[in-house]
């Protein structure tokens, strides 16, 4: 599998409509919770919780602050922690408790605490529960949590130093936790937790499972340095611990290695960054997408692997266990256990088979089973990804978070659209197209290139959004920017399953937002732009330039996968000529203008899609170079594109040339702008109007020229 290509389109922060939320002096917007039925997004930040309109997050509905007292801050600082940063209250748990309340926990100056937030009054109830085991002490420590039927399942550290890891259930009738032992958890970095619903109420009483994902230090591989291993672990919701052995401890805790590697190159991705569980009506069993980086990541590599949950369940219910054996010098080695396995199977959830054998609860499991699972929490079998390979491998990027949406294209094909955020504040949108990865677009969510800490996807039909949280705020982005594709070719070449071209309105529309039937819409996920209607007429721009001056002709081709070149009077322009240059890889500069430069200039793009090359006329300019006579009285003028008053525009219609151009000579390269030749010496007097037109011509666009006096400061 090859590395994923660069994103086809890059949207700068200012180019697209992004909604933002941030409050002055509030940082670390890392906990996001969406209430789809209320159209409310809850945001947990440092010392604050906000409720905002999920359809427009800039609309704040409620806020509540949970600050640390000066006394607590001082005590925290005495223990060597920073009063300005660490000794504050970082909201780490934000979970639904009931229809009217949230369960909130914070680091609380290294004294983790939890409370209930009443959603009607938007006030804390002041319960001030001990958050130990539910929330980390240190804001820098890893954590994960999930609320299951009013009980909080968490993975975090249990002490001030963060040296005691714990996976626990906070429950009034049956609280449980992991053993504090290296075979169970060895310096884990918690990433994600979720419940997988079975059918506990069905006559077979299949227990719900809670899955935990983390990276930990390996016990089974021996190297000079510490090897990190990505893990999937699970516990059973119906677990009540053992009666004597494993009393108040999980009897169902099992863990296995997650494999994500590129078999052909020996490239192993062993640091888990994020996980997303994809549930869809079309999926019998959920699929989970996991985001990885290698342990030694000096080249900026990231990978996404997808797993069938049934693969993991198979490992836990039928796989072999690992066993620790003591070798010379009391050194421990982990090997496959091939001995007899007690019945009921260690770590198994209580099912109808166990009940039939009179094991109706974990409390009456035999000691042999409990002792075995206590000593053998690690499976020998690994959980392998779908197709035994990553869905995506990307170079020169550190991905941080992932969400996935399953959507149907016009032709009925189902695509899993991966939204992956980066440590530079960007969001990549990618799909698998015939065993290759296509990164549809990259959107710069955060202007100051800060890491995205949290990513959330709304699942409500109609208005669909991705929400991203960072240190400075939250950004809301639509799933697609279909309207930004100005032509049918652009819309088709985007190969975005959310977008289709509507010939009647001549716009690229979002499929899930069109109420009208999809009849007549054009979408070609192969990128075959020949399905687009013929453009016999295209608008062009007419410019008047001064003899001897320099002209810049704009060409707004957004595709990073396209090569741009220019034709003049149907001949391809030569790059080596001192006459021309490229600005910003796409715009044409013409130096030392003369009458011979008058004529039709076309900007064309060439883009390889699969095995085809698609040519497009992106912009057309008609240039006329004139010797401007001296005006009687005139200030120095320049014609520039500005927000000033409208003077004139000339948009004309011409036939588009249909011939395929030869290999381009002047073309954009990844190196950026071409060095400009020296400017010609100015001619004439200072009172001559210096006319420079800086337009942004585009097919079917109506960009306007404005006249502005340079005296107007």
């Amino acid at each position: 599998m090859a590395f994923a290509p660069i994103p086809r389109i890059t949207w700068e922060h200012r180019e697209v409509h992004l909604v933002q939320f941030h409050e002055p002096d509030i940082y670390n917007y890392s906990a996001l919770l969406l209430s789809e039925d209320k159209d409310t997004l809850y945001i947990g930040a440092r010392e604050a919780v906000f409720a905002v309109n999920a359809l427009n997050i800039s609309e704040k509905q409620h806020e509540v602050y949970w600050k640390v007292s000066e006394d607590k801050k001082a005590k925290c600082a005495e223990k060597g922690k920073s009063k300005q940063t660490e000794c504050l209250n970082y909201i780490r748990v934000l979970q639904p408790l009931s229809a009217t309340s949230l369960y909130v926990c914070g680091t609380n100056a290294f004294q983790p605490a939890c409370d209930h937030l009443n959603l009607t009054s938007f006030k804390f109830l002041g319960k001030n529960e001990d958050g130990k085991g539910r929330c980390p002490f240190d804001p820098a420590h890893s954590y994960t949590s999930v609320m299951v039927d009013g009980e909080l399942y968490s993975g975090t550290s249990y002490n001030f130093l963060g040296s005691e890891p714990i996976i626990s259930r906070n429950s009034s009738h049956s609280p449980l936790r992991t053993e504090y032992a290296i075979p169970w958890l060895n310096e884990p970095s918690f990433v994600f937790a979720d419940v997988i619903r079975k059918s506990p109420d069905s006559p077979d009483g299949e227990d719900d499972r809670v899955y935990f994902f983390f990276t930990e230090v390996s016990v089974e591989y021996e190297f000079v340095f510490r090897v990190l291993i990505p893990r999937i672990a699970r516990v059973c919701k119906g677990d009540q611990g053992g009666l004597r052995t494993l009393q108040k401890k999980w009897t169902s805790f099992l863990k296995a290695r997650l494999i994500c590697s590129r078999p052909d190159s020996g490239l192993v991705f062993n640091v888990l960054r994020d996980v997303f569980v994809l549930r869809s009506p079309g999926l019998k069993v959920p699929v989970f997408y996991a985001l990885f980086t290698p342990q030694l990541n000096n080249v900026g590599l990231s990978a996404v692997c997808a797993y069938n949950l049934s693969t993991a369940e198979e490992v836990f219910s039928h796989g072999k266990y690992m066993q620790s054996t003591t070798v010379e010098q009391s050194h421990t080695k982990w090997v496959r256990y091939n001995g007899p396995v007690p019945k009921p199977r260690p770590g198994a959830c209580i099912d109808s088979e166990a009940r039939a054998a009179n094991y109706t609860s974990s409390l009456n499991l035999p000691d042999k089973t409990l002792q075995f699972v206590k000593d053998h929490p690690l499976m020998d079998d690994s959980v392998t990804p779908i197709d035994n390979r990553p869905r995506l491998i990307k170079k020169d990027v550190n991905y941080t978070q992932i969400v996935v949406d399953r959507t149907q294209a016009l032709d009925g094909t189902v695509y899993d659209v991966m939204f992956v955020s980066t440590d530079r504040g960007a969001l990549h949108k990618a799909i698998s197209l015939e065993h290759a990865v296509h990164i549809i677009e990259e959107t710069q969510l955060f202007q100051d290139f800060e890491p995205v800490q949290t990513l959330l996807l709304s699942s409500k039909k109609g208005n669909r959004f991705v929400y991203a949280g960072s240190n400075s705020g939250v950004v809301q982005a639509p799933l697609a920017f279909c309207g930004k594709h100005g032509t049918c070719e652009d819309c088709v070449l985007a190969r975005d399953p959310y977008c289709a071209w509507s010939p009647p309105t001549a716009t690229c529309v979002a499929l899930h937002q069109t109420e009208s039937p999809s009849r007549g819409l054009i979408q070609e996920m192969s990128g075959d732009a020949s399905v687009c209607p013929d453009k016999s007429k295209g608008s062009y721009r007419q410019h008047f330039f001064k003899h001897g001056g320099t002209a810049e002709l704009k060409c707004s081709q957004k595709s990073n996968l396209a090569r741009v070149f220019w034709k003049f009077q149907n001949g391809v322009l030569k790059a080596e000529s001192p006459k021309y240059g490229l600005m910003g890889r796409k715009n044409l500069l013409i130096f030392n203008l003369s009458e011979g430069d008058s004529g039709v200039y076309q900007c064309l793009s060439e883009e390889r899609v699969k095995n085809k090359t698609v040519f497009q006329v992106v912009a057309k300019h008609v240039l006329e170079v004139k010797v401007v006579p001296k005006p009687v009285v005139a200030p120095t003028l320049s014609v520039v594109q500005t927000e000033g008053s409208r003077i004139a525009t000339k948009v004309l219609v011409a036939s588009t040339q249909g011939s395929s151009p030869p290999t381009p000579a002047v073309q954009a390269t990844s190196s950026g702008a071409i060095t400009l030749p020296p400017k010609p010496a100015p001619t004439g007097t200072s009172c001559e109007p210096k006319i420079v037109i800086n337009t942004v011509p585009q097919l079917h666009s109506e960009k306007t020229m404005y006249l502005k006096s340079s005296d107007n400061r």
Partner: antibody, heavy 121, light 112 residues
Framework: EVKLEESGGGLVQPGGSLSLSCAAS????????MSWVRQPPGKAPEWLGF??????????EYSASVKGRFTFSRDNSQSILFLHMNALRPEDSATYYC????????????WGQGTSVTVSS | DVLMTQTPLSLPVSLGDQASISCRSS???????????LEWYLQKPGQSPKLLIY???NRFSGVPDRFSGSGSGTDFTLKISRVEAEDLGIYYC?????????FGGGTKLEIK
């Protein structure tokens, strides 16, 4: 031997309240879901809902016909199941059965003998 | 709610004869886990219902092998190969795949 025995039935006026009990023996009560079923005279039984076991926090599931009016609870120390009925209507008149739901692939394996409730003015 | 319809309402038989009772559900009663939780109960006069068949065709412990269940999707059948006197009473089908669980209207097996 598994035994279930209902009690507390009788005559009650419309709008009134009544509580039924079901004493269980012969099995570990906390490990089982327990269900209530009623049967009006000469008609088919009607499932009213269940209360889950200890592993599932003794939470409840009700049928729409009784939701909001009837409440299930259990005294696990005494192995007794309760059905609290409020705002009773004439159509609630029936024989009320408690039954064990064992999660063994089938639903109601053991039933009590039933207790009769009549709602009439 | 899933409506369970039983036919016939009444089934007069001679002892030793075969009896067949039909039960039809208003929608598929295949559970999301793939199992079909269709059960048959027998209620004798003055007694509570007793479980005979579960998961369409499995006999509950102690149930004689003259009782058999079959069917799938929405159509199910209970057969008694040779009716005995102790088999008389009202038979109910019962679906426990979807909440609320629902009973059929009953079929009365009586002597001809």
């Amino acid at each position: 031997e598994v035994k279930l025995e209902e009690s507390g039935g009788g005559l009650v006026q419309p709008g009134g309240s009544l509580s039924l009990s079901c004493a269980a023996s012969g099995f570990t009560f906390t490990d089982y879901y327990m269900s209530w079923v009623r049967q009006p005279p000469g008609k088919a039984p009607e499932w009213l809902g269940f209360i889950r076991n200890r592993a599932y926090g003794y939470t409840t599931e009700y049928s729409a016909s009784v939701k909001g009016r009837f409440t299930f609870s259990r005294d696990n120390s005494q192995s007794i199941l309760f059905l609290h009925m409020n705002a009773l209507r004439p159509e609630d008149s029936a024989t009320y059965y408690c039954a064990r739901y064992p999660l063994l692939g089938y639903a109601l394996d053991y039933w009590g003998q039933g207790t009769s409730v009549t709602v009439s003015s | 709610d899933v409506l369970m319809t039983q036919t016939p309402l009444s089934l007069p038989v001679s002892l030793g004869d075969q009896a067949s009772i039909s039960c039809r559900s208003s929608q598929s009663i295949v559970h999301s886990n793939g199992n079909t939780y269709l059960e048959w109960y027998l209620q004798k006069p003055g007694q509570s219902p007793k479980l005979l068949i579960y998961k369409v065709s499995n006999r509950f412990s102690g149930v004689p092998d003259r009782f058999s269940g079959s069917g799938s999707g929405t159509d199910f059948t209970l057969k008694i190969s040779r009716v005995e006197a102790e088999d008389l009473g009202i038979y109910y089908c019962f679906q426990v795949s979807h909440v609320p669980w629902t009973f059929g209207g009953g079929t009365k097996l009586e002597i001809k």
